[in-house]
């Protein structure tokens, strides 16, 4: 009798262990599925948010702080206050961002459109020559590629011309102490899928 009970007990434990193993595998499979679904949801949310943002130039789903412009993977703010290059650097840092970095042609087109001014205001970029006459570097240390734009050496600047400003789509090296407007950029956050929630009562009201 004791042996039989013990045997039944063994069977039950084995079955439980097997069930536990199966459940554990199911759980792992569900976790993988969950990660995939979350990724898909994120992708769809970003695509939809981008469309909504493109239509209006603003939307609550935007991953950028209010008043900051969403372009590509970044958020940008073009400020009207004029500062030295270094003051712009610290100002951007205080805004949890860095100075404008132009990585590709579309970024240059965007920056030119945003900074264009009939009053010839120019904007500092994050490009500088840490050592006069040496290589141009972005603030994060990456080298500048001359394929992207031509830097005009501004001979009117009295001192060293080691900082770079954008003026109406043209790029000039300037004295870093000159006062120019600041452009700050920061990486865009993740689009929150819940920020796309449309209250039922608004459905059917236009697009």
């Amino acid at each position: 009798q004791y042996y039989q009970l013990s045997n039944t007990g063994q069977d039950t434990i084995s079955q439980m262990e097997e069930r536990l193993g199966n459940t554990s595998q199911e759980l792992q499979s569900l976790q993988v599925q969950n990660i995939k679904l979350a990724g898909s949801l994120q992708h769809v949310a970003e695509k939809l948010c981008r469309e909504l943002y493109n239509k209006a130039g603003a939307h609550r789903c935007s991953p950028c702080t209010e008043q900051w412009k969403w372009h590509g993977d970044n958020c940008y703010q073009f400020y009207k206050d004029s500062k030295s290059w270094e003051d712009c650097k610290y100002f951007c840092l205080s805004e949890n961002s860095t100075m404008l970095k132009i990585n590709k042609q579309e970024d240059l087109e965007f920056a030119a459109s945003q900074s264009y001014s009939e009053f010839f205001y120019s904007y500092w970029t994050g490009l500088l020559r840490p050592d006069s006459g040496k290589a141009w570097l972005w603030m994060d240390g990456t080298p500048f590629t001359s394929e992207l734009f031509h830097i005009i050496i501004d001979v009117t600047s009295p001192r060293s011309r080691d900082c770079v400003a954008i003026l109406n789509g043209m790029i000039f090296s300037k004295d870093c102490k000159e006062l120019k407007r600041c452009v700050c950029e920061r990486r865009a956050g993740m689009v929150k899928p819940e920020s796309l929630h449309v209250p039922p009562e608004t459905l059917g009201e236009g697009d």
């Epitope: 412009k69 579309e106 087109e109 459109s113 945003q114 394929e147 031509h150 005009i152 789509g169 043209m170």
Partner: antibody, heavy 117, light 107 residues
Framework: QIQLVQSGSELKKPGASVKVSCKAS????????MNWVRQAPGQGLEWMGW????????TYADDFKGRFVFSLDTSVSTAYLQISSLKAEDTATYFC??????????WGQGTTVTVSS | DIQMTQSPSSLSASVGDRVTITCRAS??????LAWYQQKPGKSPKFLIY???TLASGVPSRFSGSGSGTDFTLTISSLQPEDFATYYC?????????FGQGTKLEIK
């Protein structure tokens, strides 16, 4: 994908007005300016000016000051070119092109305006 | 205003030929020059900016060079689809101006 779709061809009488539209899609309209370029039949390209899509402020090339007006409706991502007191010499294809006044990566398909009595 | 002058105004060539179009600015525009290709009844197609930087999707047989006032567009080996009109345009401030165009025809 990025597209600029312009309104269809127009046939107008001298003295009339015309309004050409350019609807943008596939990007944030207010992130890039919009330019207008004219091409008379068998002729080259002429930059007419541009409009800042953030501020709505237009800038006109000297030859296009007066009868030419650039405007926007940002709610529908559309730029407009209006020409008043049409003359025979306004007969041309008008293109919209995206960007600040620099180089133009994206162009509309063009709108032909014919002015004839 | 900056004047842009292209030469020649027309050019006949055969498939496989190497072709060069020149563009001259009335004053220095540094490297602020763009090139476009236009086919009849179509809008211009952006080829090059910054005198030498190829737009994405443009075949590598196209190349640009020059700075200051003298610029060239070279097609290293003409393809049937390259027969079109080519325009240069400065982007060194406003007003923007275009060259009068170079029509590239089949010989």
């Amino acid at each position: 994908q990025i597209q600029l779709v312009q309104s269809g061809s127009e046939l107008k009488k001298p003295g009339a007005s015309v309004k050409v539209s350019c609807k943008a899609s596939g990007y944030t309209f207010t992130n890039f300016g919009m330019n207008w370029v004219r091409q008379a039949p068998g002729q080259g390209l002429e930059w007419m000016g541009w409009i800042n899509t953030n501020t709505g402020e237009p800038t006109y090339a000297d030859d296009f000051k007066g009868r030419f007006v650039f405007s926007l409706d940002t709610s529908v991502s559309t730029a407009y070119l209006q020409i008043s007191s049409l003359k025979a010499e306004d007969t041309a294809t008008y293109f919209c092109a995206r960007g600040a006044p620099a180089w133009f990566t994206y162009w509309g398909q063009g709108t032909t305006v014919t002015v004839s009595s | 205003d900056i004047q842009m002058t292209q030469s020649p105004s027309s050019l006949s060539a055969s498939v496989g030929d190497r072709v060069t179009i020149t563009c001259r600015a009335s004053e220095s525009i540094y490297s602020y020059l763009a090139w476009y290709q236009q086919k009849p009844g179509k809008s211009p197609k952006f080829l090059i900016y910054n005198a030498k930087t190829l737009a994405s999707g443009v075949p590598s047989r196209f190349s640009g060079s020059g700075s200051g006032t003298d610029f060239t567009l070279t097609i290293s080996s003409l393809q049937p689809e390259d027969f079109a009109t080519y325009y240069c345009q400065h982007h060194f401030g406003t007003p923007l101006t275009f060259g009068q165009g170079t029509k590239l025809e089949i010989k």
